[in-house]
């Protein structure tokens, strides 16, 4: 194993990869420890502020972790001659916050990418497709690590941070041989509809601590190949039957569903039958109810359609008529608010006029006032019509 | 020098157990994708499990439940536990590691050890 | 269940002949697929993976191509040291598989 540290500085590498000149094939950068038998380049927690350019061309496993790159710009990774056999990435906890289209291209045989505990509050749509064409070269990723990557809330762009990132996997269809996908920890509200539809080939998919409320709009019935489904620690509350079905009809998936608050009423009648008759939940004896409160820590697997039942609610014609009353009020409000908005200048002119009486009818207390107040006056009130 | 070495190699009966260690020097262990391939004399090779650097374990249909492979990353040694051995187990294994690291997925082995002789007969 | 099948079994040849040697996968494989020499007495060195990537300090003779279910192995002009075996090894799963390995193909000197 050779290792080489910066012997003038410790300042952060700096080099610009423009300017470099091709790498010797077994130069290994400051700051960097390069092992040609493991073919591996180790530049952690080194505060790198920019991607070394003088990486050997050896190099398969490339840890730039615990560094400070801040911005991943397009083609950061682009040599010449290009590193054609790095084929694992790891650049997690580099405090990057942007990456940029194109930033992972010419790199032929990179198939693992951990971008995880990066607070990315930029991720273009182009950063895995590298071009914005509809259907881009496909990319050689095969396992992509993304978990974490949410930035703080004052970070935050004005968009969907989870648009956001189902932009990137779809952009070009370019992630269709994807078969690891990591989204763990990133305070998902939803998974945007289109997603799993562009990412056939995923094998393992985890979304464990996310804050995923429902499944009700997201597919899972091209995933055929899916052997591993992480849904532990979300905001499930109950699973609807043709989401039920989708993963029966899954010849290979386990799904884990730990943790997650399960509301035990009669919507939940479906999900206890499928449980109890399904091979498919791992752990499925662990789950248990977080509501109604009667409920609590209940095993879901050991309730009977008795023991789910919903508040009386009112019967379903009723329901109906009292929509339509909602709606009808609802719409004379608005017409009566439109009739004010129309005849506004009547009405400020009204407003005036009463305005004016108010002041005369208050001058007329006041007058009315000062006689009662003076004694000499006071026979005159009874008489007073003002 | 990057190198694997298997050792645990041996003469057992049918029906006993045998543990086979292969020790890795000049590389971590932990981060790669390590499997064992066996090879009957005068035979093709045969893969029967990996281990991925997230701990996944895949298995041969035929060593499920007999071959239990495990990671010892402290003693940066690979195990490979066999029970209820058969004659047709008698083989050279092979302890292999792909240069790629991998949580998950595929193994191509670009690094291979000397293999040590495993012979089950009564 | 996938399947390596290779062909042929074994093959003859001369020093300076071009050799092909191809590998079918019972079902589609992508272009997770490797290529290793063995020769007698010696643990298998990897020559090719990922259908095409030749690996470090493999001669520039040998090449593979395929994707798919249809792989090949070339080597442009034999050499006396290239007469051995030769297996292909699929990558794509290793769930519910009897082998990833290809059956091999023997190259002896004509």
């Known amino acids: 194993t050779s290792s080489a540290s910066s012997s003038s500085s410790s300042a952060p590498f700096l080099a610009s990869a423009a300017s470099a000149q091709p790498p010797l094939p077994d130069q290994c950068p400051a700051l960097c420890e390069c092992s040609e038998a493991a073919r591996t380049v180790k530049c952690v927690n080194r505060n790198l502020t920019e991607v070394p350019t003088d990486l050997p061309l050896y190099v398969r496993n490339l840890f730039l972790t615990g560094n400070q790159l801040a911005v991943l710009p397009a083609g950061a990774f682009a040599r010449r001659p290009p590193l054609a056999e790095l084929a694992a990435l790891n650049l997690s906890g580099s405090r990057l916050d942007e990456v940029r289209g194109g930033a992972f291209e010419h790199l032929p045989s990179l198939r693992q990418l951990d971008l995880s505990h990066n607070p990315l509050a930029y991720l273009s749509p182009f950063a895995f497709s590298g071009s914005n064409a509809s259907i881009s070269a496909p990319s050689p990723l095969v396992e992509l690590i993304l978990n974490h990557i949410v930035p703080p809330d004052d970070k935050r762009q004005n968009r969907s941070f989870e648009g956001m990132v189902a932009a990137a996997l779809v952009a070009g269809r370019a992630l269709q041989g994807l078969h690891l996908l990591e989204l763990a920890s990133n305070h998902f509200l939803y998974l945007p509809r289109d997603v799993l539809a562009q990412l056939p080939s995923l094998r393992y998919l985890d979304l464990s601590n996310n804050s995923l409320v429902s499944l009700t709009y997201v597919s899972f019935r091209n995933l055929t190949h899916l052997e591993s489904l992480h849904l532990e620690d979300n905001a499930l509350k109950v699973l609807h039957n043709g989401t039920l079905a989708e993963l029966q009809g899954l010849p290979h998936v386990r799904v884990f569903l730990d943790n997650n608050p399960w509301v035990c009423d009669c919507h939940m009648a479906d999900m206890v039958t499928w449980l109890k008759q399904t091979g498919v939940v791992q752990g499925k004896d662990r789950l248990t109810c977080a509501f109604p409160e009667k409920m609590r820590n209940r095993v879901l697997l050991e309730l009977n359609s008795a023991d789910l039942d919903c508040d009386p609610i009112l019967p379903p014609s009723l329901q109906t008529s009292y929509v339509f009353l909602g709606i009808v009020l609802a719409l004379i409000g608005a017409i009566f608010l439109l009739v004010l908005y129309l005849n506004r200048k009547g009405i400020k002119k009204w407003m005036h006029n009463i305005r004016d009486a108010c002041r005369d009818h208050m001058e007329g207390y006041h007058y009315r006032y000062e006689i009662n107040a003076d004694p000499r006056l006071t026979n005159l009130s009874s008489n007073s019509d003002v | 020098e990057v190198q694997l070495e298997e050792s645990g190699g041996g003469l057992v009966k049918p029906g006993g157990s045998l543990r086979l260690s292969c020790a890795a020097s000049?590389?971590?262990?932990?981060?790669?994708?390590v499997g064992w391939v066996r090879q009957a004399c005068g035979k093709g090779l045969e893969w029967v499990s990996i281990?991925?650097?997230?701990?996944?374990?895949y298995y041969a249909n035929w060593a499920k439940g007999r071959f239990t492979i495990s990671r010892d990353n402290s003693k940066n040694t690979l195990y490979l536990q066999m029970n209820s051995l058969r004659a047709e187990d008698t083989a050279v294994y092979y302890c292999a590691r792909d240069a790629s690291v991998s949580v998950y997925y595929w193994g191509y082995f670009d690094l291979w050890g000397r293999g040590t002789l495993v012979t089950v007969s009564s | 269940d996938i399947q390596m099948t290779q062909s042929p079994s074994t093959l003859s040849a001369s020093v300076g002949d071009r050799v092909t040697i191809t590998c079918q996968a019972s079902?589609?494989?992508?272009?997770?697929l490797a290529w290793y020499q063995q020769k007698p007495g010696k643990a298998p060195k990897l020559l090719i993976y990922r259908a095409s990537t030749l690996e470090s300090g493999v001669p520039s003779r040998f090449s593979g191509s395929g994707s798919g279910t249809e792989f090949t192995l070339t080597i442009s002009s034999l050499q006396p040291d290239d007469f051995a075996t030769y297996y292909c090894?699929?990558?794509?799963?290793?769930?519910?598989?009897?082998?990833?390995f290809g059956q091999g193909t023997k190259v002896e000197i004509k």
């Open positions: 281990i991925y650097g997230s701990g996944r374990t």
């Open positions: 000049g590389i971590d262990l932990s981060h790669y994708v």
């Open positions: 090894q699929q990558g794509y799963t290793y769930s519910e598989i009897d082998n990833a």
């Open positions: 079902q589609s494989i992508g272009s997770e």
